[in-house]
Interface confidence: low
């Protein structure tokens, strides 16, 4: 069964910078990745970035840079502008659309006790949402 993992990390050198890493574990090719915060995309979450392997990427503030790390994983850099966007307490969700499996989504957040530079452990179990 395909799975999606999510890691959120705070940059050690820049406490206002966060990076979300997401990956897809499973067969098939990725057709689209959507990253959202505050919940799943279209279900209370706000879209931060859309990455397409051929058409490119698009991101929305406060996302700073979305990029592919491998053919099945992406990273999204975020700029925390202060109290209005408390990333430390926010849930980030990544949805991978793959052919022929469908869509798989998982969410993760920065652990409350995490030190700068440490990342949250991968979230092994996806939200039960296969479109």
């Amino acid at each position: 069964t395909p799975e999606v993992w999510v890691q959120v990390q705070m940059e050690a050198t820049e406490l206002s910078s966060f990076t979300v890493h997401c990956g897809f574990l499973g067969p098939g090719s990725i057709s689209l990745v959507t990253v959202s915060w505050g919940g799943p995309d279209g279900a209370g979450g706000t879209k931060l970035a859309v990455l397409h392997p051929e058409l490119g990427t698009r991101q929305w503030a406060p996302a700073r840079q979305a990029r592919w790390e491998t053919q099945s994983s992406i990273s999204l850099a975020l700029e925390d502008s202060g109290a209005s966007s408390p990333f430390a307490n926010t849930t980030f969700c990544c949805k991978f659309a793959s052919f022929p499996e469908g869509s798989w989504e998982s969410c993760g957040s920065l652990p409350p006790s995490s030190d700068p530079g440490l990342s949250a452990p991968p979230t092994p179990v996806p939200i039960l949402r296969a479109d």
Epitope: L32, G42, G44, T46, H52, R58, Q59, W60, A61, S84
Partner: antibody, heavy 129, light 107 residues
Amino acid sequence: QVQLQESGPGLVKPSQTLSLTCTVSGGSISSGGYYWSWIRQHPGKGLEWIGYIYYSGSTSYNPSLKSRVTISVDTSKNQFSLKLSSVTAADTAVYYCARDLDYDILTGYPRWDYGMDVWGQGTTVTVSS
Amino acid sequence: EIVMTQSPATLSVSPGERATLSCRASQSVSNNLAWYQQKPGQAPRLLIYSESTRATGIPDRFSGSGSGTEFTLTISSLQSEDFAVYYCQQHNNWPRTFGQGTKVEIK
């Protein structure tokens, strides 16, 4: 060509619930790829976004109205509806329904053309006893 | 929510002249900004989306520019049908928010 048409009573009494329906023609709500929104405009004033619904039933509301708003969808009738409870004279406005673009969930290909590209002609609702 | 502020409130321009309308966001909206035109008794019409892309059927005298928090709508040579109210709207975050509008009137 997609067209939207609002319908509902033009006069609502204070404290009652305002109910409007938007009928979509020339395209299917359930094809996905769009947010279906309600926007209102007070007399002589600017535009205020009320909320949206996705064909799946997912909704998002303006925090200033959230406690009073319900937006629902009926894909079998190709309609989406607005209910605004406990209305007062301050809810007197022209109410518009509109289509707000998103990426195409069917193909998985983004459409980089965001914005409310199709609007209904608007319906005037007056709150008065 | 993101507050959108438009200036000026009213712009008096002669036909054939250039009109420049400004829109400021209270925080960055990247390039996710749309412009709408509204005439009396009509629904708004989408002119520009994603800061600078003209919607279908919009003449090239309309152009958008800017990024982040500062945006501009330019009408290069005003035609009689361009006198209307113009609204900016951010589509970066929910809730969608609009500016209060700029009325372009005949000088």
